[in-house]
């Protein structure tokens, strides 16, 4: 990697300057794409900040940028004006250039902020040169708020500063009035005044009357050393503008402004809704606006004018629809700082806000809303509803256009059909079931963000409060006992004070759920079951006949049961029991209680176990002899021989 360019940036005080390829230009011997030449800001500027033109100019400091972004003029340095005057200030940025696999290169970018530079944004080289407004035929003090050369003094080292002053030499006098210093008029024989006299409030302009034409004076300002000696240092020649206003003049009244809303990259006319004033004694063409500070999201242009930005326009331009805002690619809102004047009153500050609308928004739905069965309710989060466009939209508002069928949405505990992203993020928006007849629901919302809308459907599912233990593979051709070691809704029973019941929705593909007889005297064999209860599981009354896949050699396979679980006062939930099956292996210990084993293996299994007096199923098989109901195989055969 190599780094070219001057690595110096000259910035006008208080202005924004893009980094350019003249300033910073990286290249690699491999001819790497500028997008892949990455700068990391190791130490940011002290006198200002670095930011990206198309990202939030009020956000966090820029940490990374690419050479491509430098080429595009998107990396900007903004100098922040200090409270104390200065003539020249220096700032540095420490950067690290990287583009693997090349070694990183450290770089320092020097920034010079100087009043010496010619600045289109700032025609004066003085700390202040704002001009003066004076009523016709009257007088007004020229204070340091209007004219201030403190920055020239700031070029002198502070120990000697008290011995120095700034001498203003008037090179062209006002034509419609007089300048006075300590009540003495200035004239060709005495054309000077000092910064110290200005600071003491001794400089006055007196208008001579006879009209409201513009006035002003030209001057040269330079440093003056001890005992009035001229010293080398900064100097400037400028004009000071004096505006004479009609004493009868009523100042214009700015009207409330509505932000301009525009999609990025487009153009929109500025109307009176954005910029208007009430001024009964001025024509629209006499009301002038000047752009003091423009945002980074676009510029103002005049129809019929050049394609570039305009800094001056009139109310007539606005009223006729000639003034337009041209948005660039930025998605960030911005504000124009303007000054408005009717030419006879002091300028008034005004602002024009520009809100960049997304061309489209999208509601991101990352997951359905899962409602825990025993709770019957759940808070929405950004997982369910989040609006994005070219950026995240935290201000999004939602309105239900189709409510849920089996429940309702609550905000702060009360049913609501409208809510905000903020309420979602704070967990205040809750879906609660009110009708416990479905394990699913959905609702449709319309999302609105920055004037654009989009709709989305939020799906709701109930998460079963059911403990499922499938364990290792189960033997094909066997009947195993379905009990709470496999399916257990005991916690749901405790939470609802009811006996949960199950409905078989689907499966198994190879096999069936059966009810096994309680005693030998009970008639018939295993009955096919489609519904059962937690009590049936606890009583050991249920069996799962694990079938063999048809039409192929015995082999391991997967199967499942899909169940709907119901309990009082809560919504039903769908759950599944997924299990693996394999051909029966008599030598293998199975982790479930077997009620029967396949026919062929039964005769080889050795002596039957002794009968248990209770008639309960025997212990789980832990040896080649499987445990079976009624304490042995003969008991099982006897009980089931007519099935």
């Amino acid at each position: 990697l190599s780094l070219e360019g001057s690595r110096t940036l000259t910035v006008c005080p208080g202005s924004v300057q893009p980094l350019s390829s003249q300033t910073l230009r990286a290249s690699s011997s491999a001819g790497t794409d500028p997008q892949l030449l990455l700068y990391r800001v190791v130490r940011g500027p002290q006198l200002g900040r670095l930011f990206h033109a198309q990202q939030d100019s009020t956000g966090e400091a820029l940490v990374n940028f690419t050479q491509a972004e430098v080429y595009a003029g998107n990396i900007l340095y903004e100098h922040e004006m200090p409270t104390e005057p200065f003539w020249e200030a220096h700032d540095t940025l420490e950067l690290q250039l990287s583009s693997p696999p090349a070694r990183d290169v450290a770089a320092t970018l020097a920034v010079a902020v100087s009043f010496e530079a010619a600045c289109p944004q700032r025609p004066s080289h003085l700390w202040k040169n704002k001009g003066l407004w004076v009523p016709e035929g009257q007088r007004a003090k020229i204070t340091m708020a209007a004219l201030d050369a403190s920055n020239l003094l700031a070029s002198v080292p502070s120990p000697q500063r008290l011995e120095h002053d700034v001498l203003f030499q008037v090179t062209q006098f006002p034509s419609r009035g007089q300048l006075l210093v300590s009540e003495e008029p200035l004239h060709a024989g005495q054309p000077h005044f000092l910064q110290s006299q200005l600071a003491a409030g001794q400089l006055v302009y007196a208008h001579g009357g006879g009209g409201t034409q513009q006035d002003g004076f030209h001057f040269r300002a330079h440093l003056q050393g001890p005992a009035g000696a001229t010293v080398a240092g900064p100097q400037t020649s400028e004009a000071f503008a004096i505006t004479v206003r009609d004493v009868n003049e009523r100042p214009p009244q700015p009207q409330a402004s509505v932000p301009l809303r525009i999609t990025r990259g487009s153009r929109a006319p500025i109307s009176r809704a954005q910029l208007s004033v009430v001024d009964p004694d001025s024509a629209p063409g006499e009301i002038e606006y000047e752009v003091q500070r423009a945002p980074h999201n676009g510029f103002l242009s005049l129809v019929g004018g050049g394609p570039g930005p305009v800094t001056h326009f009139t109310q007539a331009d606005v009223d006729s629809g000639r003034l337009a805002f041209v948005a660039n690619g930025s998605s960030v809102a911005g504000v124009f700082q303007l000054s408005m004047s009717d030419g006879a009153s002091p300028p008034l500050p005004m602002s024009l806000a520009v809100d960049i609308l997304p061309s489209a928004i999208e509601v991101q739905l990352q997951a359905p809303l899962e409602v825990p069965q025993a709770l019957g309710r759940s808070s929405l989060s950004q997982q369910q509803l989040r609006v994005v466009s070219d950026r995240e939209e935290p201000e999004a508002a939602y309105r239900l256009i189709q409510g849920p069928k089996y429940g309702h949405l609550l905000v702060g505990g009360r049913p609501a059909s409208a809510f905000s992203q903020l309420q979602i993020d704070q967990g205040e928006v809750v879906f609660a079931f009110t009708n416990f007849s479905s394990s699913h629901d959905h609702f449709r919302v319309l999302a609105l963000a920055r004037g654009v809308n989009a709709s989305a459907v939020v799906n709701i599912t109930v998460r079963a409060l059911l403990h499922v233990w499938a364990g290792g593979p189960w033997p094909q051709g066997a009947t195993l006992r379905l009990d709470p070691t496999i399916l257990d809704a005991g916690e749901l029973a405790n939470r609802t004070g009811s006996v949960p019941h199950f409905r078989l929705l689907e499966g198994p593909r190879h096999g069936r759920v059966v009810r096994v007889p309680r005693a030998r005297t009970e008639p018939g064999g295993s009955q096919l079951v489609e519904q059962f209860t937690q009590q049936d599981l606890e009583d050991g009354r249920l069996g799962l006949e694990v079938g063999r896949p048809e039409g192929r050699a015995p082999s391991p396979t997967g199967d499942s049961l899909t169940l709907e679980l119901w309990a009082q006062g809560v919504p039903p939930a769908v759950a599944s029991l997924d299990f693996a099956t394999e051909p029966y292996n008599a030598a293998r210990p199975y982790s479930v209680a077997l009620l029967s084993v396949p026919e062929a293996t039964r005769m080889e299994a050795g002596k039957p176990e002794s009968s248990t007096p209770t008639g309960e199923p025997g212990p789980m098989a832990s040896s080649p002899v499987p445990a079976v109901a009624k304490g042995g195989f003969l008991g099982f055969l006897e009980a089931n021989m007519f099935s």
Partner: antibody, heavy 112, light 107 residues
Framework: QVQLQESGPGLVKPSQTLSLTCTVS?????????WNWIRQHPGKGLEWIGY???????NYNPSLKSRVTISRDTSKNQFSLKLSSVTAADTAVYYC?????WGQGTLVTVSS | DIQMTQSPSSLSASVGDRVTITCRAS??????LNWYQQKPGKAPKLLIY???SLHSGVPSRFSGSGSGTDFTLTISSLQPEDFATYYC?????????FGQGTKVEIK
């Protein structure tokens, strides 16, 4: 603040259909969530009859479901109750409400 | 349906008394409970929603608490305008149901 006002005949003959309308002001019926009808038999407690939601879905009390219809007219900002085959046991004060706010109620007497 | 049972059915109290009315649900309703006040010949007025949230314009002497099946409405210092009948109502499960009411009378 939302205001509700019931209107309809105060006397209905047995076996006929009781019809009441609720006019909503100060808000839209597409904004509130539930628009309910509730009744109160003389000297007794409150009984929920049913609701219509902001998007036009209904739910009724199972004890009255076979006889009740609640509908709405969004253009007039109104919702209505129809209760068919009435008997003297349907004599009550009928209220429309969104639960936060209630109409003042209208007494309906079922008598020949 | 969920049954809502209020107790007592009626009570006599004096101005300034602390009054407590309870409401029991036949099964859990989480916090989805409203309390209403009704005066003779008038419509009910919402006092408290979501068990303990005060409706706008309701004096702070009214408060609600509870969760699940047992709920309480408390009037910290009874005022003359508080003599009325009070109803609880659940909105956890359809159909919505009301308690039978508690009449607060002047002793």
């Amino acid at each position: 603040q939302v205001q509700l006002q019931e209107s309809g005949p105060g006397l209905v003959k047995p076996s006929q259909t009781l019809s009441l309308t609720c006019t909503v002001s100060g808000g839209s019926i597409t904004d509130g969530y539930y628009w309910n009808w509730i009744r109160q038999h003389p000297g007794k407690g409150l009984e929920w009859i049913g609701y219509i939601t902001f998007d036009g879905r209904n739910n009724y009390n199972p004890s009255l479901k076979s006889r009740v219809t609640i509908s709405r007219d969004t253009s007039k900002n109104q919702f209505s109750l129809k209760l068919s085959s009435v008997t003297a046991a349907d004599t009550a004060v009928y209220y429309c409400a969104d639960f936060d706010y209630w109409g003042q109620g209208t007494l309906v007497t079922v008598s020949s | 349906d969920i049954q809502m049972t209020q107790s007592p059915s009626s009570l006599s109290a004096s101005v300034g008394d602390r009054v407590t009315i309870t409401c029991r649900a036949s099964r859990g309703i989480r916090e989805y409970l409203n309390w209403y006040q009704q005066k003779p010949g008038k419509a009910p007025k919402l006092l408290i929603y979501y068990t303990g949230s005060l409706h706008s314009g309701v004096p702070s002497r009214f408060s609600g608490s509870g969760s699940g099946t047992d709920f309480t409405l408390t009037i910290s210092s009874l005022q003359p305008e508080d003599f009325a009948t009070y109803y609880c109502q659940q909105y956890s499960e359809l159909p919505w149901t009301f308690g039978q009411g508690t009449k607060v009378e002047i002793k």
